[in-house]
Protein backbone atom coordinates (compact mmCIF):
# COMPACT_ATOMS: atom_id res chain seq x y z
CA UNK A 1 0.00 0.00 0.00
CA UNK A 2 2.98 2.30 -0.18
CA UNK A 3 3.74 5.08 -2.58
CA UNK A 4 7.47 5.65 -2.73
CA UNK A 5 9.02 8.31 -4.88
CA UNK A 6 12.23 10.25 -5.34
CA UNK A 7 12.23 13.95 -5.99
CA UNK A 8 15.43 15.94 -6.19
CA UNK A 9 14.24 19.36 -7.17
CA UNK A 10 12.44 22.14 -5.42
CA UNK A 11 9.15 23.91 -5.83
CA UNK A 12 9.01 26.75 -8.27
CA UNK A 13 8.38 30.14 -6.78
CA UNK A 14 5.92 31.51 -9.29
CA UNK A 15 2.90 33.71 -8.79
CA UNK A 16 0.36 34.78 -11.36
CA UNK A 17 0.80 38.36 -12.46
CA UNK A 18 -1.99 40.90 -12.30
CA UNK A 19 -3.89 42.34 -15.24
CA UNK A 20 -1.74 44.11 -17.79
CA UNK A 21 1.07 41.52 -17.48
CA UNK A 22 0.15 39.37 -20.44
CA UNK A 23 3.08 38.42 -22.64
CA UNK A 24 4.10 36.72 -25.85
CA UNK A 25 7.77 36.15 -24.95
CA UNK A 26 10.23 36.72 -22.10
CA UNK A 27 11.19 40.06 -23.63
CA UNK A 28 7.70 41.37 -22.86
CA UNK A 29 8.31 40.98 -19.12
CA UNK A 30 10.20 43.26 -16.73
CA UNK A 31 13.49 42.24 -15.09
CA UNK A 32 13.05 39.38 -12.65
CA UNK A 33 10.08 37.98 -14.56
CA UNK A 34 9.58 35.57 -17.46
CA UNK A 35 6.73 34.65 -19.76
CA UNK A 36 4.86 31.61 -18.45
CA UNK A 37 2.59 29.82 -20.92
CA UNK A 38 -0.16 27.36 -20.09
CA UNK A 39 -1.64 24.68 -22.34
CA UNK A 40 -5.09 26.22 -22.58
CA UNK A 41 -4.73 29.68 -21.06
CA UNK A 42 -3.09 32.95 -21.95
CA UNK A 43 0.55 33.60 -21.06
CA UNK A 44 1.49 35.99 -18.29
CA UNK A 45 4.62 37.37 -16.68
CA UNK A 46 5.63 35.31 -13.65
CA UNK A 47 8.23 35.88 -10.96
CA UNK A 48 11.63 34.40 -11.78
CA UNK A 49 12.67 31.17 -10.11
CA UNK A 50 15.34 31.17 -7.43
CA UNK A 51 18.26 28.82 -6.84
CA UNK A 52 17.25 25.12 -6.81
CA UNK A 53 13.92 25.74 -8.54
CA UNK A 54 13.00 23.81 -11.69
CA UNK A 55 13.53 25.40 -15.08
CA UNK A 56 13.39 24.61 -18.76
CA UNK A 57 15.47 27.61 -19.85
CA UNK A 58 17.71 30.20 -18.23
CA UNK A 59 15.20 33.02 -18.78
CA UNK A 60 13.06 31.36 -16.11
CA UNK A 61 15.83 31.76 -13.51
CA UNK A 62 16.49 34.91 -11.52
CA UNK A 63 19.46 37.16 -12.32
CA UNK A 64 22.74 35.57 -11.24
CA UNK A 65 21.46 32.06 -11.91
CA UNK A 66 21.29 29.86 -15.00
CA UNK A 67 19.32 26.74 -15.90
CA UNK A 68 21.56 23.69 -15.53
CA UNK A 69 20.15 20.14 -15.68
CA UNK A 70 16.61 21.47 -15.22
CA UNK A 71 17.55 23.43 -12.09
CA UNK A 72 18.21 27.14 -11.53
CA UNK A 73 21.82 27.19 -10.40
CA UNK A 74 23.99 30.02 -9.10
CA UNK A 75 26.51 31.03 -11.75
CA UNK A 76 29.40 30.12 -9.42
CA UNK A 77 27.91 26.69 -8.64
CA UNK A 78 27.21 25.02 -11.96
CA UNK A 79 28.25 21.43 -11.34
CA UNK A 80 25.61 18.91 -12.49
CA UNK A 81 22.81 18.32 -10.04
CA UNK A 82 23.12 14.54 -10.36
CA UNK A 83 26.65 14.81 -8.97
CA UNK A 84 25.38 16.05 -5.64
CA UNK A 85 25.30 13.87 -2.58
CA UNK A 86 21.99 13.29 -0.81
CA UNK A 87 23.28 12.81 2.73
CA UNK A 88 22.93 9.07 2.45
CA UNK A 89 19.39 9.28 3.78
CA UNK A 90 17.68 6.94 1.39
CA UNK A 91 18.09 3.71 3.34
CA UNK A 92 16.34 2.27 6.37
CA UNK A 93 16.55 4.01 9.74
CA UNK A 94 16.40 2.47 13.15
CA UNK A 95 14.43 5.39 14.49
CA UNK A 96 13.04 6.84 11.27
CA UNK A 97 14.60 10.20 12.01
CA UNK A 98 17.03 12.26 10.04
CA UNK A 99 19.99 14.07 11.56
CA UNK A 100 19.99 17.78 12.25
CA UNK A 101 21.72 19.54 10.67
CA UNK A 102 22.97 16.40 8.87
CA UNK A 103 26.03 17.80 7.17
CA UNK A 104 28.43 15.10 8.32
CA UNK A 105 27.85 12.84 5.33
CA UNK A 106 29.01 15.32 2.73
CA UNK A 107 31.84 13.71 0.73
CA UNK A 108 35.31 15.21 0.82
CA UNK A 109 36.15 17.58 -2.00
CA UNK A 110 32.58 18.83 -2.37
CA UNK A 111 32.24 21.83 -0.12
CA UNK A 112 28.81 23.14 0.70
CA UNK A 113 27.81 26.11 -1.39
CA UNK A 114 26.37 28.74 0.93
CA UNK A 115 23.03 29.96 -0.36
CA UNK A 116 21.11 32.98 0.83
CA UNK A 117 18.36 32.23 3.34
CA UNK A 118 15.77 33.44 0.84
CA UNK A 119 16.63 30.57 -1.51
CA UNK A 120 16.35 27.90 1.18
CA UNK A 121 13.53 25.42 1.00
CA UNK A 122 10.43 26.00 3.09
CA UNK A 123 8.26 23.42 4.84
CA UNK A 124 6.92 20.91 2.34
CA UNK A 125 9.32 21.87 -0.44
CA UNK A 126 11.58 19.22 -1.86
CA UNK A 127 15.27 19.01 -1.09
CA UNK A 128 18.47 17.09 -1.67
CA UNK A 129 19.97 17.59 1.77
CA UNK A 130 19.36 19.47 4.98
CA UNK A 131 21.55 22.35 3.85
CA UNK A 132 18.94 23.02 1.15
CA UNK A 133 16.34 23.75 3.83
CA UNK A 134 15.76 26.90 5.82
CA UNK A 135 16.53 27.38 9.51
CA UNK A 136 14.80 24.93 11.83
CA UNK A 137 14.15 22.46 9.02
CA UNK A 138 15.76 19.23 7.86
CA UNK A 139 15.58 17.21 4.66
CA UNK A 140 13.62 14.01 5.27
CA UNK A 141 11.82 11.43 3.18
CA UNK A 142 8.05 11.59 2.78
CA UNK A 143 6.37 9.11 0.45
CA UNK A 144 8.17 9.50 -2.86
CA UNK A 145 10.30 12.51 -2.15
CA UNK A 146 12.51 14.22 0.36
CA UNK A 147 11.09 17.43 1.71
CA UNK A 148 11.96 20.10 4.23
CA UNK A 149 10.31 19.27 7.54
CA UNK A 150 10.54 21.07 10.88
CA UNK A 151 13.10 19.80 13.38
CA UNK A 152 11.37 18.40 16.43
CA UNK A 153 10.60 20.65 19.38
CA UNK A 154 10.62 19.84 23.07
CA UNK A 155 7.94 17.30 23.94
CA UNK A 156 7.43 16.07 20.38
CA UNK A 157 7.58 12.36 19.66
CA UNK A 158 10.90 11.37 18.09
CA UNK A 159 10.60 7.59 17.93
CA UNK A 160 9.53 5.88 14.73
CA UNK A 161 6.58 4.36 16.57
CA UNK A 162 5.01 7.79 16.67
CA UNK A 163 3.85 7.34 13.06
CA UNK A 164 1.81 4.51 11.61
CA UNK A 165 4.32 2.48 9.60
CA UNK A 166 3.54 -0.35 7.22
CA UNK A 167 5.12 -3.75 6.79
CA UNK A 168 5.96 -2.98 3.18
CA UNK A 169 8.04 0.12 3.85
CA UNK A 170 8.25 1.36 7.43
CA UNK A 171 10.69 4.12 6.60
CA UNK A 172 8.88 6.18 3.98
CA UNK A 173 8.01 8.79 6.59
CA UNK A 174 11.16 10.20 8.14
CA UNK A 175 11.15 12.61 11.05
CA UNK A 176 13.76 15.22 11.65
CA UNK A 177 15.95 14.79 14.68
CA UNK A 178 15.35 16.81 17.83
CA UNK A 179 16.33 20.46 17.59
CA UNK A 180 19.40 22.04 19.21
CA UNK A 181 19.67 21.52 22.94
CA UNK A 182 17.29 18.55 22.84
CA UNK A 183 17.78 14.81 22.83
CA UNK A 184 15.49 11.89 22.04
CA UNK A 185 14.78 10.01 25.28
CA UNK A 186 12.19 7.66 26.68
CA UNK A 187 9.43 9.51 28.45
CA UNK A 188 9.30 8.95 32.20
CA UNK A 189 5.72 8.41 33.33
CA UNK A 190 4.24 9.57 36.65
CA UNK A 191 5.12 6.28 38.36
CA UNK A 192 8.75 6.69 37.24
CA UNK A 193 8.48 3.98 34.60
CA UNK A 194 10.01 4.51 31.16
CA UNK A 195 7.40 4.39 28.43
CA UNK A 196 8.09 3.07 24.94
CA UNK A 197 7.36 6.51 23.57
CA UNK A 198 10.45 8.62 23.07
CA UNK A 199 10.20 12.39 23.02
CA UNK A 200 12.55 15.32 22.58
CA UNK A 201 13.77 16.48 25.98
CA UNK A 202 16.23 19.07 27.25
CA UNK A 203 19.76 17.73 27.43
Amino acid sequence: LVLDFNNIKSSADVQGAGKGSLCASDRDCSEGKFCLAFHDERSFCATCRRVRRRCQRSAVCCPGTVCVNDVCTAVEDTRPVMDRNTDGQDGAYAEGTTKWPAEENRPQGKPSTKKSQSSKGQEGESCLRTSDCGPGLCCARHFWTKICKPVLREGQVCSRRGHKDTAQAPEIFQRCDCGPGLTCRSQVTSNRQHSRLRVCQRI
Epitope: D4, F5, D70, G124, F143, P150, A169
Partner: antibody, heavy 120, light 111 residues
Framework: EVQLVESGGGLVQPGGSLRLSCAAS????????ISWVRQAPGKGLEWVAS??????????YYPDSVKGRFTISRDNAKNSLYLQMNSLRAEDTAVYYC???????????WGQGTTVTVSS | EIVLTQSPATLSLSPGERATLSCRAS??????????INWYQQKPGQAPRLLIY???KQGSGIPARFSGSGSGTDFTLTISSLEPEDFAVYYC?????????FGGGTKVEIK
Protein backbone atom coordinates in the same frame (compact mmCIF):
# COMPACT_ATOMS: atom_id res chain seq x y z
CA GLU B 1 8.80 21.69 -21.66
CA VAL B 2 7.80 18.72 -19.51
CA GLN B 3 5.61 16.29 -21.41
CA LEU B 4 4.00 12.97 -20.53
CA VAL B 5 2.18 11.10 -23.30
CA GLU B 6 0.24 7.93 -22.57
CA SER B 7 -0.66 5.25 -25.10
CA GLY B 8 -1.78 1.64 -25.29
CA GLY B 9 -5.37 1.96 -24.12
CA GLY B 10 -8.21 0.13 -25.81
CA LEU B 11 -11.03 -2.35 -25.46
CA VAL B 12 -10.24 -5.64 -23.75
CA GLN B 13 -12.35 -8.50 -22.46
CA PRO B 14 -12.59 -9.33 -18.74
CA GLY B 15 -9.64 -11.50 -17.76
CA GLY B 16 -7.55 -10.08 -20.57
CA SER B 17 -4.32 -8.12 -20.53
CA LEU B 18 -3.15 -4.73 -21.73
CA ARG B 19 0.11 -2.81 -21.55
CA LEU B 20 0.07 0.97 -21.21
CA SER B 21 3.03 3.20 -22.02
CA CYS B 22 3.97 6.71 -20.97
CA ALA B 23 6.63 8.58 -22.94
CA ALA B 24 8.33 11.32 -20.94
CA SER B 25 10.38 14.28 -22.10
CA UNK B 26 11.63 17.62 -20.84
CA UNK B 27 13.22 16.37 -17.60
CA UNK B 28 15.83 13.91 -16.37
CA UNK B 29 13.50 10.90 -16.38
CA UNK B 30 15.51 8.44 -14.29
CA UNK B 31 15.86 10.88 -11.41
CA UNK B 32 12.17 11.08 -10.67
CA UNK B 33 9.40 8.89 -9.45
CA ILE B 34 6.45 8.44 -11.72
CA SER B 35 2.97 7.05 -11.15
CA TRP B 36 -0.21 5.85 -12.72
CA VAL B 37 -3.50 7.38 -11.55
CA ARG B 38 -6.85 6.36 -13.00
CA GLN B 39 -10.31 7.85 -13.26
CA ALA B 40 -13.38 5.71 -13.92
CA PRO B 41 -16.06 7.31 -16.12
CA GLY B 42 -17.80 10.07 -14.18
CA LYS B 43 -15.85 9.20 -11.04
CA GLY B 44 -12.96 10.56 -9.01
CA LEU B 45 -9.23 9.89 -9.06
CA GLU B 46 -7.54 6.73 -7.77
CA TRP B 47 -3.82 6.04 -7.38
CA VAL B 48 -2.82 2.83 -9.21
CA ALA B 49 0.94 2.30 -9.04
CA SER B 50 4.25 4.09 -8.58
CA UNK B 51 7.93 3.53 -9.21
CA UNK B 52 10.57 5.62 -7.48
CA UNK B 53 13.52 7.32 -9.11
CA UNK B 54 17.17 6.43 -9.01
CA UNK B 55 17.77 7.91 -5.55
CA UNK B 56 15.29 5.49 -3.96
CA UNK B 57 16.23 2.44 -6.01
CA UNK B 58 13.34 2.26 -8.53
CA UNK B 59 11.09 0.64 -5.96
CA UNK B 60 7.52 -0.20 -7.00
CA TYR B 61 4.29 0.26 -5.04
CA TYR B 62 0.64 -0.63 -5.50
CA PRO B 63 -2.67 -0.32 -3.68
CA ASP B 64 -4.39 -3.56 -2.67
CA SER B 65 -6.95 -3.17 -5.47
CA VAL B 66 -4.38 -3.90 -8.20
CA LYS B 67 -1.60 -5.71 -6.35
CA GLY B 68 -0.71 -8.99 -8.07
CA ARG B 69 -2.53 -8.00 -11.26
CA PHE B 70 -0.74 -4.83 -12.36
CA THR B 71 3.00 -4.32 -12.77
CA ILE B 72 4.64 -0.92 -13.14
CA SER B 73 8.05 -0.69 -14.79
CA ARG B 74 10.29 1.87 -16.41
CA ASP B 75 12.90 1.94 -19.15
CA ASN B 76 15.16 4.85 -18.29
CA ALA B 77 17.09 4.55 -21.55
CA LYS B 78 13.86 5.13 -23.45
CA ASN B 79 12.39 7.66 -20.99
CA SER B 80 9.35 5.43 -20.77
CA LEU B 81 7.00 4.17 -18.09
CA TYR B 82 4.82 1.08 -18.46
CA LEU B 83 1.83 -0.49 -16.77
CA GLN B 84 1.23 -4.18 -17.49
CA MET B 85 -2.37 -4.98 -16.59
CA ASN B 86 -3.44 -8.60 -16.28
CA SER B 87 -6.66 -10.28 -15.15
CA LEU B 88 -8.58 -7.16 -16.04
CA ARG B 89 -12.00 -6.55 -14.54
CA ALA B 90 -14.90 -4.33 -15.53
CA GLU B 91 -14.06 -2.03 -12.62
CA ASP B 92 -10.63 -1.35 -14.18
CA THR B 93 -12.38 0.62 -16.93
CA ALA B 94 -10.99 4.15 -16.66
CA VAL B 95 -8.81 6.84 -18.13
CA TYR B 96 -5.25 6.08 -17.02
CA TYR B 97 -2.90 9.01 -16.43
CA CYS B 98 0.80 8.98 -15.77
CA UNK B 99 1.90 11.67 -13.36
CA UNK B 100 5.18 12.72 -11.83
CA UNK B 101 6.45 15.00 -9.09
CA UNK B 102 9.12 17.36 -10.32
CA UNK B 103 8.70 20.47 -8.22
CA UNK B 104 7.14 19.26 -4.97
CA UNK B 105 5.85 16.08 -3.41
CA UNK B 106 2.41 16.19 -5.07
CA UNK B 107 1.53 15.13 -8.64
CA UNK B 108 2.46 18.33 -10.45
CA UNK B 109 2.82 17.09 -14.04
CA TRP B 110 0.24 14.86 -15.74
CA GLY B 111 -0.20 13.30 -19.13
CA GLN B 112 -3.50 13.64 -21.00
CA GLY B 113 -4.50 10.04 -20.33
CA THR B 114 -5.34 6.88 -22.27
CA THR B 115 -8.71 5.11 -22.07
CA VAL B 116 -9.01 1.47 -21.04
CA THR B 117 -12.38 -0.25 -21.46
CA VAL B 118 -12.91 -3.72 -20.01
CA SER B 119 -16.08 -5.22 -21.44
CA SER B 120 -17.35 -8.42 -23.00
CA GLU C 1 -7.23 4.52 4.85
CA ILE C 2 -7.96 8.21 5.22
CA VAL C 3 -11.30 9.17 3.66
CA LEU C 4 -11.70 12.68 2.24
CA THR C 5 -15.19 14.16 1.97
CA GLN C 6 -15.65 17.21 -0.24
CA SER C 7 -18.55 19.62 -0.03
CA PRO C 8 -20.62 20.83 -1.63
CA ALA C 9 -20.81 18.34 -4.48
CA THR C 10 -21.77 21.19 -6.80
CA LEU C 11 -21.28 24.93 -6.42
CA SER C 12 -23.20 27.25 -8.76
CA LEU C 13 -21.63 30.68 -8.99
CA SER C 14 -21.14 33.56 -11.41
CA PRO C 15 -17.84 34.91 -12.72
CA GLY C 16 -16.36 37.39 -10.28
CA GLU C 17 -17.87 35.67 -7.26
CA ARG C 18 -15.88 34.06 -4.46
CA ALA C 19 -15.81 30.26 -4.32
CA THR C 20 -15.22 28.34 -1.09
CA LEU C 21 -14.70 24.59 -1.35
CA SER C 22 -14.40 22.29 1.65
CA CYS C 23 -12.45 19.07 2.19
CA ARG C 24 -12.84 17.10 5.42
CA ALA C 25 -10.55 14.20 6.34
CA SER C 26 -11.59 11.20 8.44
CA UNK C 27 -8.50 11.79 10.59
CA UNK C 28 -5.84 14.47 10.85
CA UNK C 29 -3.59 14.87 7.84
CA UNK C 30 -1.14 17.05 9.77
CA UNK C 31 2.26 15.64 10.62
CA UNK C 32 5.79 16.97 10.97
CA UNK C 33 4.26 20.43 11.28
CA UNK C 34 2.86 20.21 7.75
CA UNK C 35 -0.67 19.67 6.42
CA UNK C 36 -0.32 16.98 3.78
CA ILE C 37 -3.30 18.03 1.68
CA ASN C 38 -3.24 18.99 -1.99
CA TRP C 39 -5.83 20.49 -4.33
CA TYR C 40 -6.24 19.76 -8.07
CA GLN C 41 -8.36 21.31 -10.78
CA GLN C 42 -9.76 19.23 -13.63
CA LYS C 43 -11.59 20.52 -16.69
CA PRO C 44 -13.66 18.23 -18.94
CA GLY C 45 -11.48 16.06 -21.16
CA GLN C 46 -8.29 17.26 -19.50
CA ALA C 47 -5.84 15.91 -16.95
CA PRO C 48 -5.87 17.24 -13.40
CA ARG C 49 -3.68 20.25 -12.62
CA LEU C 50 -2.02 20.82 -9.25
CA LEU C 51 -3.19 24.05 -7.60
CA ILE C 52 -2.16 23.81 -3.95
CA TYR C 53 0.16 21.50 -2.02
CA UNK C 54 0.99 21.22 1.68
CA UNK C 55 -2.35 22.80 2.51
CA UNK C 56 -1.57 26.32 1.43
CA LYS C 57 1.40 26.47 -0.96
CA GLN C 58 0.70 27.37 -4.56
CA GLY C 59 1.84 25.06 -7.32
CA SER C 60 4.00 26.36 -10.13
CA GLY C 61 2.36 29.14 -12.12
CA ILE C 62 -0.92 29.06 -10.24
CA PRO C 63 -2.71 32.44 -10.19
CA ALA C 64 -2.86 34.20 -6.83
CA ARG C 65 -6.66 34.00 -6.75
CA PHE C 66 -6.32 30.35 -5.68
CA SER C 67 -5.50 29.87 -2.01
CA GLY C 68 -5.63 26.99 0.45
CA SER C 69 -6.12 27.03 4.20
CA GLY C 70 -6.96 24.77 7.12
CA SER C 71 -5.30 22.22 9.36
CA GLY C 72 -6.01 18.91 11.01
CA THR C 73 -9.12 17.53 9.35
CA ASP C 74 -10.75 20.61 7.80
CA PHE C 75 -9.39 22.31 4.70
CA THR C 76 -10.64 24.99 2.33
CA LEU C 77 -9.80 25.97 -1.22
CA THR C 78 -10.77 29.56 -1.97
CA ILE C 79 -11.01 31.17 -5.39
CA SER C 80 -11.18 34.86 -4.59
CA SER C 81 -12.83 35.97 -7.82
CA LEU C 82 -13.96 33.38 -10.34
CA GLU C 83 -12.66 33.70 -13.87
CA PRO C 84 -14.47 31.97 -16.75
CA GLU C 85 -11.67 29.37 -16.97
CA ASP C 86 -12.10 28.41 -13.29
CA PHE C 87 -15.34 26.49 -13.82
CA ALA C 88 -14.19 22.90 -13.37
CA VAL C 89 -14.07 20.03 -10.89
CA TYR C 90 -11.76 20.36 -7.87
CA TYR C 91 -10.28 17.43 -5.96
CA CYS C 92 -8.45 17.33 -2.65
CA UNK C 93 -5.85 14.65 -1.96
CA UNK C 94 -4.11 13.54 1.22
CA UNK C 95 -0.50 12.43 1.29
CA UNK C 96 -0.06 11.88 5.00
CA UNK C 97 -0.54 8.13 5.00
CA UNK C 98 -0.69 5.19 2.64
CA UNK C 99 -2.54 4.75 0.42
CA UNK C 100 -2.76 8.31 -0.88
CA UNK C 101 -6.43 9.11 -1.39
CA PHE C 102 -8.54 11.68 -3.22
CA GLY C 103 -11.83 13.30 -2.31
CA GLY C 104 -14.90 12.81 -4.47
CA GLY C 105 -14.63 16.27 -6.01
CA THR C 106 -16.58 19.52 -6.10
CA LYS C 107 -17.96 20.78 -9.39
CA VAL C 108 -17.91 24.56 -9.75
CA GLU C 109 -20.44 25.45 -12.43
CA ILE C 110 -21.67 28.68 -13.97
CA LYS C 111 -24.87 29.92 -12.39
Amino acid sequence: EVQLVESGGGLVQPGGSLRLSCAASGFTFSSYAISWVRQAPGKGLEWVASVSGTGLGFQTYYPDSVKGRFTISRDNAKNSLYLQMNSLRAEDTAVYYCATSLENYAFDYWGQGTTVTVSS
Amino acid sequence: EIVLTQSPATLSLSPGERATLSCRASESVDDFGISFINWYQQKPGQAPRLLIYAGSKQGSGIPARFSGSGSGTDFTLTISSLEPEDFAVYYCQQLKEVPPTFGGGTKVEIK
